[in-house]
């Protein structure tokens, strides 16, 4: 379906508002350090140009690809070399190499200040004074901090952000109305960003076969009444959408996502009974709703898989004739029967089945060889079941903060070379699995927990790739996507690690500690805990607990003192000395 002018095609399909929003997101995700005003200027120039192409598709430059148009525009930024260093070299390349170069320079951990939330009245004034600029600023600030955020979904977040201000700035108690909504958007946004980052890592590091396998398993769980051909079609379309978004082709991605939503709503009867309420909603909400839709009920009386996948005379014939389709069908059949399994477990089972067929179909008696293949699945299923059970018990016993601390200690011992801020961020997020998943019924725990952990561990992998320091992390991150979590779980104390020299400065605290929010206090204490383990990796749980209890008491005491700073100056060295003695 070729068009004379791609930019005109997308402008007409998406409409001006979404077109401008997506171009702003694209530019902000590529040039993450550029000031807001610069991006707005570039977006306006691109939009004016798009309008000339809509008026006359044969006008000059209208036939150029979007990558060429956008890349040319980005390369007009005057301070490119000073701000971005070697990224400026991308501009010397031709498409498609130039776009690949820009993609490679996306920074998952940009050196940007944390977003500070102004007073509610200040925000409401800004919203009323210039709503359009206020919303563009939101897109820009989120996109530059999350360079792989799913762009059409970010438009949905922006719509909710706008709705929150429109409602709450009229309310009697603006803060009570607005702040919970903003907290919810922030938390959902971070989760959405992390989930999308895993999809992009899956596509970019492991290829579209890996992503398609993930999608077959997940969509088969969601739509167990749909036939395999239908699931396959959805997987193909979804893979295209995510490949485009992860590749920076945000206009095409948003357009194709809208087409996919339209298709799903037109074919509800052959997909799922749960789509009805999504399909009545406007586009952005509809797409979001479809992506989050609950699993449909499983068809009654699904037969055993053994007949077709173990006992049939044609197992090896099917495997030889159409390997990926046959394995995809196996995955579909297993997943639709097991909404209680994590997607990663389902993929491990498919991988185990594939390995067995690869070996057995070359054997003298294939059937005899693969007859017990389903028995081999048992340990694979039990491992995450036991892990979830043990960790939920620990979470219920300790509560979230102490559970996070247990994970901080566990992961610092496994990979002590990793930077302290990364260990704190990742372990805190790993610890959130408890509150998120452990309260769920048994049948939902594993899919919730393991698939969430995969998202969090991907963050570790992405940060580590930027600054590699541990061979063990590299190995777990790169060997197998589906075995990342088991790989990290299996890591033990790193015996080769040389403990970090003690640095009193690391354990020196000041009165500013007392004015921090509860969350910031926790991060400070957890940072100290990681440093402690790096200094004494063989410290026992009891020793570490003792030190942390003393730390909490010391901070509490000084924060109650009249002269807080003097207290910290006096009690701090005592705490350090006592801690060193306790850990000797």
């Amino acid at each position: 379906d070729t068009h004379k002018s791609e930019v005109a095609h997308r402008f007409k399909d998406l409409g001006e508002e979404h077109f401008k929003g997506l171009v702003l997101v694209a530019f902000s995700q590529y040039l993450q350090q550029c000031p807001f005003e610069e991006h707005v200027k570039l977006v306006n120039e691109v939009t004016e140009f798009a309008k000339t192409c809509v008026a006359d598709e044969s006008a000059e430059n209208c036939d150029k690809s979007l990558h060429t148009l956008f890349g040319d525009k980005l390369c007009t930024v005057a301070t490119l070399r000073e701000t971005y260093g070697e990224m400026a070299d991308c501009c010397a390349k031709q498409e498609p190499e130039r776009n690949e170069c820009f993609l490679q320079h996306k920074d998952d951990n940009p050196n940007l200040p944390p977003l500070v939330r102004p007073e509610v009245d200040v925000m409401c004034t800004a919203f009323h004074d210039n709503e359009a600029t206020f919303l563009k600023k939101y897109l820009y600030e989120v996109a530059r901090r999350h360079p792989y955020f799913y762009a059409p979904e970010l438009l949905f977040f922006a719509a909710r952000y706008k709705a929150a201000f429109a409602e709450c700035c009229q309310a009697a108690d603006k803060a009570a109305c607005l702040l919970p909504k903003l907290d919810e958007l922030r938390d959902e946004g971070k989760a959405s960003s992390a989930k999308q980052r895993l999809k992009c890592a899956s596509l970019q590091k492991f290829g579209d076969r890996a992503f398609k396998a993930w999608a077959v398993a997940r969509l088969s769980q969601k739509f167990p009444k749909a036939e395999f051909a239908e699931v396959s079609k959805l997987v193909t379309d979804l893979t295209k959408v995510h490949t485009e978004c992860c590749h920076g082709d945000l206009l095409e991605c948003a357009d194709d996502r809208a087409d996919l939503a339209k298709y799903m709503c037109e074919n509800q009867d052959s997909i799922s009974s749960k789509l009805k309420e999504c399909c009545d909603k406007p586009l952005l909400e509809k797409s979001h709703c479809l992506a989050e839709v609950e699993n449909d009920e499983m068809p009654a009386d699904l037969p055993s898989l053994a007949a077709d996948y173990v006992e049939s005379k044609d197992v090896c014939k099917n495997y030889a004739e159409a390997k990926d389709v046959f394995l995809g069908m196996f995955l579909y059949e297993y997943a639709r029967r097991h909404p209680d399994y994590s997607v990663m477990l389902l993929l491990r089972l498919a991988k185990a089945y594939e390995a067995t067929l690869e070996k057995c179909c070359a054997a003298a008696d294939p059937h005899e060889c693969y007859a017990k293949v389903f028995d081999e699945f048992q340990p694979l299923v039990e491992e995450p079941q036991n892990l979830v059970k043990q960790n939920c018990e620990l979470f219920e016993q300790l509560g979230e903060y102490k559970f996070q601390n247990a994970l901080l200690v566990r992961y610092t011992k496994k990979v002590p070379q990793v930077s302290t801020p990364t260990l704190v961020e990742v372990s805190r997020n790993l610890g959130k699995v408890g509150a998120k998943c452990c309260k769920l019924p048994e049948a939902k725990r594993m899919p919730c927990a393991e698939d969430y952990l995969s998202v969090v561990l991907n963050r570790l992998c992405v940060l580590h790739e930027k600054t590699p320091v541990s061979e063990k992390v590299t190995k777990c991150c790169t060997e197998s996507l589906v075995n990342r979590r088991p790989c990290f779980s299996a890591l033990e104390l790193d015996e080769a690690y040389v403990p970090k020299a003690f640095n009193a400065e690391t354990f020196t605290f000041h009165a500013d500690m007392c004015t921090l929010s509860e969350k910031e206090k926790q991060v400070k204490k957890q940072t100290a805990l990681v440093e402690l383990v790096k200094h004494k990796p063989k410290a026992t749980k009891e020793q570490l607990k003792g030190v942390m209890d003393n730390f909490a008491a010391f901070v509490e005491k000084c924060c109650k003192a009249d002269d807080k700073e003097a207290c910290f100056a006096e009690e701090g060295p005592k705490f350090v000395a006592a801690s060193q003695a306790a850990l000797a």
Epitope: S232, P299, D308, D314, E321, A322, V325
Partner: nanobody, 123 residues
Framework: QVQLNESGGGMVQAGGSLRLSCAAS????????AGWFRQAPGKEREFVAA???????TYADSVKGRFIISREYAKNTVALQMNSLKPEDTAVYYC?????????????????WGQGTQVTVSS
Amino acid sequence: QVQLNESGGGMVQAGGSLRLSCAASGRTVSNYAAGWFRQAPGKEREFVAAINWNKTTTYADSVKGRFIISREYAKNTVALQMNSLKPEDTAVYYCAAVFRIVAPKTQYEYDYWGQGTQVTVSS
């Protein structure tokens, strides 16, 4: 186990049309390859048409352009629309199924068979 039951056979004038239907029970066969075969008196059973999981179809040269095989997932059925019928199409038509990704053309590769339905085309 899969049970197959054909229907829709009968007598028709040359040039006319018939639609055969094959209903599967025992399990859903949407991922199975399904085929139609026919056997005229005193002749070997021969391949007519087949369809696989993603509705890829194959036909015998003698029926190409006249017959259309299709499947309906929701009803667990496979149909054979027969147009421009000729006297030489007279035979007992059998529906067959097998769990294969690529639909086979030989009868020996199919595991499940229906009882057959008679089609008679008079000139």
